[in-house]
């Protein structure tokens, strides 16, 4: 048992049939001596007396909020959380499995530049009585600052019959430096608490791994005279760390119709224009990569060819 | 070129060749995602690899101030990759295929690293550890492991190279 | 199986025209763009040209320009290239090549041998 | 127009030799570098599209790699059937160029 917060207890189970699970014991936190008697959450049956109580807990009926009394008044509380434990791997019911970019990626995390800030996601079906709270650092021996906000629920969706939500945390690591080459990897913690189940997510990533920019800005056409060629030119993204000179972006240039299938256009430039054939009812798209180190493109930014 | 005394590197051909080292890293361990290296224990690996980090003066405004400490550094990691992708880890069992870009990347930090410090001039270098890994798949896991340190490391070498270039060559 | 075959090899006189047809089966003929390539005896690959199909649009190499035509008929998913004031430096193997990327080639014809002697 | 250089126009290599053929481009095409291989009397075949990327069907021991202005072909491991001329091509702007073609011939 180890404590998550104040008055907030985690009981970790070995989680098979007929398991003996833990026993707890409770201390009442109050300089009282005597008739001090003991509930669990709304019930008024007294489970036992005196300034410590000690319970057997094996499942979710022993979890819950235990309250030391007395003539009447309420001393303390202690909330008791399970978290599971099955054929020796920690329970992970609490959030969906996203698969990417591997198997067991329940976080996934994005930044759109070198500053330091970056973003989680994670996704749950559960509604109701849930909450996250989020920790990071930079290494895990001599841990350096970094500070999340709150975690909130950034979308929900629709997947056939389930409603699917959607939680993000932004975070900024204190003492950030664009221009280093990370050795140590940047830690995210993620406590889930669902009703009396917890559950923890980690993550692990360098910065430049997780890099992701936004698309190029201010996608411009030129047509050229007497010929069916178009030069497109863009900007680099706002959010993109500078100078430009130092952060350079590669970019990739398609046209193309509006279904994937159809015959397209593509040139790769690490300039901010290109030349491209454009076509009727065609879209010239534009996107960016770090020129350097092979993180995600980003989305495409778009413009019609008419 | 740059030597100790401080005058200026040939930026734009370090720029060339520090971009082709990129590619070439990426060719030669293009698989990045697939293989958390992380959950093998990094620590022995890559305590000993020269990060550029943030003392080095390889941002833009220590560029700027004096490019001879980033430069230095980069240099010292040069020559401690060159001799790493020369060492057993690299010649050893399981052999590389024969069409690995190693062999080029080897040749290329060898290239950039004598374009920094012409012969005759000496920065201090930093010493290889002996990793030396007995098992074939210890071997395979120390590749993977340099490679992705060494993509890394040559693309903070490609920006201030392309930096350099852009507002530093006379 | 995506398919292109070309006419046959044609014998010219010079400063005459010449038509070359190149016939697509095996997919969408609109899909793809057409190209066409030549490769003179013993020499490299030198591109011409390209239409997409689905429109008419055309692009060609500024060497060839004002002496060559490439053309397409949907309705028998056929591609022709002409090429006109042919002169003895013309001799070459004339290859069509199509793909759904306009920059560089996926499927090739044959080619169809031109040779332009007095 | 876009100048390709191959080199060497010609090499000579045993069956299961490793072959390697350059391209360097007059100016930098990013990755807009294609290969493709040509025997006697047939059309020329795809090999590689944007410098790296394999093509389905192809064997891997055909393998390509460059950015900018320096690209290369690698053989690993010639076959007999590998024997034939290889040209590279840039799609960066029209025209589109080929280089000169490189002959791999038998030793």
């Known amino acids: 048992i180890w404590e998550l917060k104040k008055d907030v207890y985690v009981v970790e189970l070995d989680w098979y049939p007929d398991a003996p699970g833990e026993m707890v014991v409770l201390t009442c936190d109050t300089p009282e001596e005597d008739g001090i008697t003991w509930t669990l959450d709304q019930s008024s049956e007294v489970l036992g007396s005196g300034k410590t109580l000690t319970i057997q807990v094996k499942e979710f009926g022993d979890a819950g909020q235990y309250t030391c009394h007395k003539g009447g008044e309420v001393l303390s509380h202690s909330l008791l959380l399970l978290h599971k434990k099955e054929d020796g791997i920690w329970s992970t019911d609490i959030l969906k499995d996203q698969k990417e970019p591997k198997n067991k990626t329940f976080l996934r995390c994005e930044a759109k530049n070198y500053s330091g800030r970056f973003t989680c996601w994670w996704l749950t079906t559960i509604s109701t009585d849930l909450t996250f709270s989020v920790k990071s650092s930079r290494g895990s021996s001599d841990p350096q600052g970094v500070t999340c906000g709150a975690a909130t629920l950034s979308a929900e969706r629709v997947r056939g019959d389930n409603k699917e939500y959607e939680y993000s945390v932004e975070c900024q690591e204190d003492s950030a430096c664009p221009a280093a080459e990370e050795s140590l990897p940047i830690e995210v913690m993620v406590d889930a608490v669902h009703k009396l189940k917890y559950e923890n997510y980690t993550s692990s990533f360098f910065i430049r791994d997780i890099i992701k920019p936004d698309p190029p800005k201010n996608l411009q056409l030129k047509p050229l005279k007497n010929s069916r060629q178009v030069e497109v030119s863009w900007e680099y993204p706002d959010t993109w760390s500078t100078p430009h000179s130092y952060f350079s972006l590669t970019f990739c240039v398609q046209v193309q119709g509006k279904s994937k299938r159809e015959k397209k256009d593509r040139v790769f430039t690490d300039k901010t224009s290109a030349t491209v054939i454009c076509r009727k009812n065609a879209s010239i798209s534009v996107r960016a990569q770090d020129r350097y180190y092979s993180s995600s493109w980003s989305e495409w930014a778009s413009v019609p060819c008419s | 070129r740059a030597v100790p005394g401080g005058s200026s590197p040939a930026w734009t051909q370090c720029q060339q060749l520090s971009q082709k080292l990129c590619t070439l890293a990426w060719s030669a361990h293009p698989l990045v995602g697939h293989m958390d290296l992380r959950e093998e224990g990094d620590e022995e690996t890559t305590n000993d690899v020269p990060h550029i980090q943030c003392g080095d003066g390889c941002d833009p405004q220590g560029l700027r101030d004096n490019s001879q400490f980033c430069l230095q550094r980069i240099h010292q990691g040069l020559i401690f990759y060159e001799k790493l992708l020369g060492s057993d880890i690299f010649t050893g069992e399981p052999s590389l295929l024969p069409d690995s870009p190693v062999g080029q990347l080897h040749a290329s930090l060898l290239g950039l690293s004598q374009l920094l410090q012409p012969e005759g001039h000496h920065w201090e270098t930093q010493q290889i550890p002996s990793l030396s890994p007995s098992q074939p798949w210890q071997r395979l896991l120390l590749r993977f492991k340099i490679l992705r340190s060494l993509q890394a490391f040559v693309a903070v070498a490609a920006r201030v190279f392309a930096h350099g270039a852009a507002t530093l060559s006379p | 199986e995506v398919q292109l075959v070309q006419s046959g090899a044609e014998v010219k006189k010079p400063g005459a025209t010449v038509k070359i047809s190149c016939k697509a089966s095996?997919?969408?003929?609109?899909?793809?763009?057409l190209h066409w390539v030549r490769q003179a005896p013993e020499k490299g690959l030198e591109w011409m040209g390209w239409?997409?199909?689905?429109?008419?649009?055309?692009e060609y190499a500024p060497k060839f320009q004002g002496r060559v035509t490439i053309t397409a008929d949907t309705s028998t998913d056929t591609g022709y290239l002409e090429l006109s004031s042919l002169r003895s430096e013309d001799t070459a193997v004339y290859y069509c090549a199509a793909n759904k990327e306009l920059r560089y080639f996926d499927v090739w014809g044959q080619g169809t041998l031109v040779t332009v002697s007095s | 127009d876009i100048q390709m250089t191959q080199s060497p126009s010609s090499v000579s290599a045993s069956v299961g030799d490793r072959v390697t053929i350059t391209c360097r481009a007059s100016q930098s095409i990013s990755i807009n570098l294609h290969w493709y291989q040509q025997k006697p009397g047939k059309a020329p075949k795809l090999l590689i599209y944007?410098?790296?990327q394999s093509i389905s069907g192809v064997p891997s021991r055909f393998s390509g790699y460059g950015s900018g202005t320096d690209f290369s072909l690698t053989i690993n491991s010639l076959q007999p059937e590998d024997f034939a001329t290889y040209y590279c091509q840039q799609s960066n702007s029209f025209p589109l160029t080929f280089g000169g073609g490189t002959k791999v011939e038998i030793k």
């Open positions: 944007f410098a790296s």
């Open positions: 095996g997919y969408t003929f609109s899909d793809y763009y």
């Open positions: 239409i997409d199909p689905e429109n008419g649009d055309t």
